[in-house]
């Protein structure tokens, strides 16, 4: 049977707290992404700004649930209107603002 | 030490409005990831969640009585107020207020609860 | 909502012996299953969180377990100071919930 959302989204945030939780070394060896803007449309940009991080193992279950939010196919070099204009920010700090974004959301009540 | 202290007012009028207060010592509700819940239990029954209030002022309700309840908090008193309107004598109750802390995973576990206090609706 | 429901409501045990609790949820509550404890006249307290995390100043005969829909708590050792009624509490899905609770005497 399909996972409910508030399910969804709560394995979404756990798994971004195993992340945060358990990064020793630089997360994905301090690659930058793309920062994003979290009010509007936030699964697909974060997706489309993941995207663009290969061979980080520790992020790879991040982009396949983020997939699984997004109504359509992202592809890496993929331009969204939602990025933030010219600012790069490190992988880690992108998984740490997305987390807090990402549980607000839930204890709203905002699940899709 | 983290204490939570309720007052209400014992004995309420069915139809009335039903206000409770719970004071927080020992930790600010201005802190994040700090909530606080409501909870009821009828004299000799199990136990009833009411609402939720996090830091931010995010408030979540029990659907069954959504519309008869409101929660708030006055942050530089360190309280929260808990109103229930058109009360009827099935309210009658030990009201708890409690703190919940999501720290990393969201867990809504009640860590620390205060000693309750009995209200009765009667005529 | 997930309804909670614990077996058995009552139980008595003689000190020294080994409780179980059971509590099972009407859905997968992802272990994020609370067990408190309330004796009489006074407000719950917190036991177990997150199925088997042990709150601070509980004593080590309290444990829980399970995942899914099916939770235990066990007191490996009765002692006199744990007659009180246990409720399990599913903090996964709001509204929160309750179960009807397992009241422990002494034999």
């Known amino acids: 049977s399909p996972v409910p959302p508030s399910t969804a989204l709560k394995e979404l945030i756990e798994e971004l707290v195993n992340i945060t939780q358990n990064q020793k070394a630089p997360l994905c060896n301090g690659s930058m992404v793309w920062s994003i803007n979290l009010t509007a449309g936030v699964y697909c940009a974060a997706l489309e700004s993941l995207i663009n991080v290969s061979g980080c193992s520790a992020i790879e279950k991040t982009q396949r649930m983020l997939n699984g939010f997004c109504p359509h196919k992202v592809s890496a070099g993929q331009f969204s209107s939602l990025r933030v204009r010219d600012t790069k920010i490190e992988v880690a700090q992108f998984v740490k603002d997305l987390l807090v974004h990402l549980k607000k959301l839930f204890r709203e009540g905002q699940f899709n | 030490e983290v204490t939570l202290r309720e007052s209400g007012p014992g004995l309420v009028k069915p139809t009335q409005t039903l206000t409770l207060t719970c004071t927080l010592y020992?930790?600010?509700?201005?802190?994040?990831?700090?909530?606080v819940d409501w909870i009821r239990q009828p004299p000799g029954k199990g136990l009833e969640w009411l609402a939720h209030?996090?830091?931010?002022?995010?408030?979540r309700y029990n659907p069954a009585l959504k519309s008869r309840l409101t929660i708030s908090k006055d942050t530089s008193k360190n309280q929260v107020v808990l109103k229930l309107t058109s009360v009827d004598p099935v309210d009658t109750a030990t009201y708890y207020c409690?703190?919940?802390?999501?720290?990393?995973?969201?867990?809504?576990?009640?860590?620390?609860w205060g000693q309750g206090t009995l209200v009765t609706v009667s005529s | 909502d997930i309804q909670m429901t614990q077996s058995p409501s009552s139980l008595s045990a003689s000190v020294g012996d080994r409780v179980t609790i059971s509590c099972r949820a009407s859905q997968d509550i992802r272990n994020y299953l609370n067990w408190y404890q309330q004796k009489p006249g006074k407000a719950p307290k917190l036991l177990i969180f997150?199925?088997?995390k042990l709150h601070s100043g509980v004593p080590s005969r309290f444990s829980g377990s399970g995942s899914g829909t099916d939770y235990t708590l066990t007191i490996s050792s009765l002692q006199p100071e744990d007659i009180a009624t246990y409720y399990c509490?599913?903090?996964?899905?709001?509204?929160?919930?309750f179960g009807g609770g397992t009241k422990v005497e002494i034999k």
């Open positions: 020992g930790f600010s509700l201005s802190t994040s990831d700090m909530g």
């Open positions: 209030i996090w830091w931010d002022d995010v408030k």
């Open positions: 997150y199925t088997s």
């Open positions: 509490q599913q903090g996964n899905t709001l509204p929160l919930t």
């Open positions: 409690a703190r919940t802390v999501s720290s990393g995973y969201i867990y809504y576990a009640m860590d620390y």
